[in-house]
């Protein structure tokens, strides 16, 4: 099998993550996303920072970005709703909800993912799955097929060490280990799934990938349940 990585991961089983979305700008993969309701995809707010003059669409049911697949469908975006407190220069509140032009056609390869509503930290050491079409190695290669990796959750105190993220990790964020295995450029907006439930969204802040002293940062969806519910209502 191909040895492509998210970073240090492997190619995902085709269509085994039916919630996975590719947020696209002018027909090219920009960020990951996760289908959270029939007509809504959750991603990262920073993903649309440079998209002002471009066409944003959402690809669902895909494994390969380029090859034809029966389940693949590209949806236009009716409405983009970034979190009102998201700002270009911080990683806080880095969430974006995209309303599709119509309800997604659901099936084995397209299905919303339940998301965590109980605002409690995931236990450190819990293995969580992150997937995406972000770069797969230190050369910067972008894969055609979906990649994934299992990462252990890192406790906030360690993540906030001066040598790590130096206090930047609020209670609304969580970290996962990044020693060679990690999310990276192009994975932003994608899902961190623990026990079959969406717990985090890959933040789109600029960060060195694969360095154990710079753990991956993920926005905790449970901390934003009220906002998500209000937008989806």
């Amino acid at each position: 099998p191909p040895r492509g990585r998210i970073l240090g991961g492997r190619e995902a089983e085709a269509h085994a993550r039916p919630y996975m979305a590719s947020v696209q700008l002018n027909g090219a993969h920009l960020c990951g996303g996760v289908l959270v309701a029939e007509q809504w995809v959750l991603s990262a707010a920073h993903c649309l920072e440079d998209a002002a003059d471009g066409k944003v669409q959402v690809l669902l049911g895909a494994h390969s970005l380029s090859q034809p697949e029966p389940s693949k469908r590209l949806y236009d975006v009716l409405r983009a709703v970034p979190h009102p407190d998201s700002q270009p220069d911080t990683i806080d509140h880095d969430l974006l909800l995209l309303q599709l032009s119509e309800k997604a056609t659901l099936g084995p390869a397209v299905r919303p993912l339940p998301w965590q509503r109980v605002d409690r930290d995931v236990a450190p050491g819990t293995l969580c799955d992150v997937a995406g079409w972000g770069i797969v190695n230190h050369a910067g290669r972008r894969p055609d097929s979906l990649q994934h990796v299992l990462l252990p959750v890192l406790d906030r105190a360690t993540c906030n060490r001066r040598t790590h993220h130096d206090g930047a990790i609020t209670e609304r964020l969580m970290c996962a280990e990044s020693n060679r295995r990690d999310s990276c450029k192009g994975d932003s907006g994608g899902p961190l799934v623990c026990g079959g439930v969406l717990e985090g969204v890959v933040t789109s802040g600029s960060r060195v990938c694969g360095n154990r002293k710079k753990p991956g940062i993920y926005t905790r969806v449970a901390s934003y349940a009220a906002w998500i519910d209000s937008v989806l209502a």
Epitope: V136, N137, K185
Partner: antibody
Amino acid sequence: EVQLQQSGAELVKPGASVKLSCTASGFKIKDTYMHWVKERPDQGLEWIGRIDPANGNTKYDPKFQGKATITADTSSNTAYLQLSSLTSEDTAVYYCANAMDYWGQGTSVTVSS
Amino acid sequence: QIILTQSPAIMSASPGEKVTMTCSASSSVSNMYWYQQKPGSSPRLLIYDTSNLASGVPVRFSGSGSGASYSLTISRMEAEDAATYYCQQWSSYPWTFGGGTKLEIK
């Protein structure tokens, strides 16, 4: 179509500096990494370093630390390689490459008094 | 740093002949890239992640290997394959190239 257009050949004096450019078309440089590679006659290829244009993060082969400085300007979709305190050892062809997948045509640098 | 040793340094092959060249790492690496370079031209990516063919590369090229030993094979040599071939590892920083194998046509 992805293309990398490098600046023209340079003839520079020992001790001087030179800044080479690499302008991309067909993709945004900030979406991946931009690398610079050195080729000397009969000496093969040497990886100099890379930049993540989205945030300016750079990584160099220790051998080129202090000699090479890689920068990028996302507004012009251009990556740069600056070489300082030039000696005859720096006479070479320098290539830029996007994710090591697409390569520029190379820029010849000759250091001579 | 990891040193990559390519062998042979120079080789020649007749059209239609099978060609295999190797790249040995001074310590184990997780994958290998291979490039082709013709005189006066830029390098071209042939193989990424040990065995995956880059876009537009003919299927007569293949890569294999693991640990500290990797190889590039051309199933049937063609005149246009005369070039210098380089391996490169992306496992351990700094990311190093091999010294190259020059392939000539007989």
